[in-house]
């Protein structure tokens, strides 16, 4: 009985198509597959950013795979050939590993890259990113932002920069069609006549950085002698009602402060007949049904009722 062996895939490489972190891993079939013509060969691919503790593992019948990486760090990958038992008289056979790495040669010292990068997707409509210049860079340094997400043919440069003292310190993005629920890649690089500038790479999903507008049309409705219903409306814009959580702050007679988090556009408050003044504010955030994270809106305008009779049927302001 001769031991069945199979070679690793050939020409294993990581290809950067210029998508700012979305890379192609590709390979060719192993040499000497003639013995296994009737076989469906599979490949086990393991890959990670250098420094990560865990490998991501996939098995595929293809000769390529695509995924996103952090280009601030290097990437390492390895692959081997798998033959299922049907090909080999009942034993599983795997080749040795073929390995490859990829990294972008860094220019400039780390301190020259942008600091405090912050991106907010306002009301699920307008993306704005801002940053501070690198530490110790001269005023002639300018930063440029590029972005890509699946659906764009190539990476695009920002066309509407926010400037301070002649330097780009942010970007107002155009309308981003079909850009949520997928990885959004950004590179901020820079140029200076004096010294090279380190590039920075960022990846996020837009639905996770949404800052909604605050709720509107706050009203009171007396439900019973000891209950008042607080109501408000969802903010204008594309975010559906099912995507909101709300936080309410209620103040009675300038003393009692009640804070509550609710999923609907109403909150029922227990009151006493002695209550003379009632004020509340509400803010909104995208909930876990529509995103993994989010940013609280600003507080709404304060809505107050004050007067002699809190038992009126409807209290509007």
């Amino acid at each position: 009985d001769t031991e069945i062996k199979v070679n690793p895939p050939q020409d294993f490489e990581i290809v950067d198509p210029g998508y700012l972190g979305y890379l192609y891993l590709q390979w060719q079939p192993p040499l000497s597959l003639d013995h296994f013509k009737e076989c469906t060969v599979e490949y086990e691919l393991k890959y990670r950013n250098i420094g990560s503790e865990t490998w991501k593992t996939i098995i595929t019948k293809n000769l390529h795979y695509k995924d996103g990486f952090d280009l601030n760090k290097g990437i390492e990958a390895k692959i081997h050939t798998l033959l299922p038992w049907q090909c080999t008289n009942g034993s599983e056979v795997q080749s040795s590993w073929a390995e490859t790495t990829y990294w972008i040669s860094p220019q400039g010292i780390p301190e020259t890259k942008v600091q405090d990068m912050d991106c907010v997707y306002y009301n699920w409509q307008y993306l704005l990113c801002s940053w501070k210049p690198g530490i110790g860079v001269l005023l002639d340094t300018n930063y440029n932002l590029f972005y890509w997400y699946e659906g764009l043919d190539h990476a695009l440069q920002c066309v509407d920069y926010i400037k301070a003292d002649g330097q780009n310190i942010g970007c107002r993005f155009p309308y981003l069609e079909a850009s949520d629920y997928k990885d959004f890649y950004i590179c901020v690089n820079g140029s200076s006549e004096n010294k090279p500038i380190r590039s920075s790479y960022f990846t996020f999903q837009l639905q996770n950085i949404v800052k909604p507008l605050p709720p509107v049309y706050l009203t009171f409705t007396r439900e019973s002698s000891c209950e008042i219903k607080l109501k408000w409306s969802i903010p204008l814009g594309p975010i559906p009602a099912r995507c909101f959580d709300y936080e309410i702050e209620i103040r009675e007679d300038d003393t009692t402060l009640v804070t509550a988090t609710v999923e609907n556009e109403t909150y029922t408050l227990k009151t006493t007949n002695e209550t003379r003044q009632l004020c509340f504010v509400v803010r909104s955030k995208v909930n876990i049904y529509c995103s993994d994270d989010g940013i609280w809106s600003e507080w709404s305008d304060k809505q107050c009722w004050e007067g002699e009779d809190l038992s009126k049927k409807t209290l509007l302001r």
């Epitope: 469906t40 599979e42 086990e44 593992t57 996939i58 098995i59 595929t60 019948k61 293809n62 795979y65 299922p84 038992w85 049907q86 009942g90 599983e92």
Partner: antibody
Framework: EVQLLESGGGLVQPGGSLRLSCAAS????????MSWVRQAPGKGLEWVSA????????YYADSVKGRFTISRDNSKNTLYLQMNSLRAEDTAVYYC??????WGAGAFDYWGQGTLVTVSS | DIQMTQSPSTLSASVGDRVTITCRAS??????LAWYQQKPGKAPKLLIY???SLESGVPSRFSGSGSGTEFTLTISSLQPDDFATYYC??????????FGQGTKVEIK
Amino acid sequence: EVQLLESGGGLVQPGGSLRLSCAASGFTFKLPAMSWVRQAPGKGLEWVSAITGSGGSTYYADSVKGRFTISRDNSKNTLYLQMNSLRAEDTAVYYCAKVRYGWGAGAFDYWGQGTLVTVSS
Amino acid sequence: DIQMTQSPSTLSASVGDRVTITCRASQSISSWLAWYQQKPGKAPKLLIYDASSLESGVPSRFSGSGSGTEFTLTISSLQPDDFATYYCQQYDTYPPITFGQGTKVEIK
């Protein structure tokens, strides 16, 4: 005749553990890869985990990684799923399934009858 | 992950009808697709593998076609025993193995 018979399901509190078993007969158990697939009440099918015939390689869905462990005892013709840190969303009928062809997963040509796992306080 | 999308979600048909269910993959999966039939309270049953190969013992009125991202399951003449839920499944690249959300074939 190929048969797969699951057992070990039941009611468990959130955070608890269960071990499912799948007794196989009617085929050479040590050869094919095997998988666990689950189905929450009124929902579709969700693949959970796979193991190669030798048991040398295992694969998991992200939703169970780090909490569930698949294993097999080829001398006993039995597949296992150890489920720890159970959550309400793990409530489902759990099926073991035999892989028709392939290294770790593929089309599933035989399925067990399923065992119900209910995670509730 | 490769997403599998079936259409329609529900299909009303009569005995004798020709029924077609579509499955779309979010990226090419070559021909690495299976179709299953499931009846209430029962385990799924393999009908088609490798997109178009009929599993042993499955009636010839069932057929599969397609490659790449578009696949169809066809029942040439619907029989009373065929009212069930049907699932597609890709096994091109994993983990995870992914299933479509299911198509329920009900009596019109």
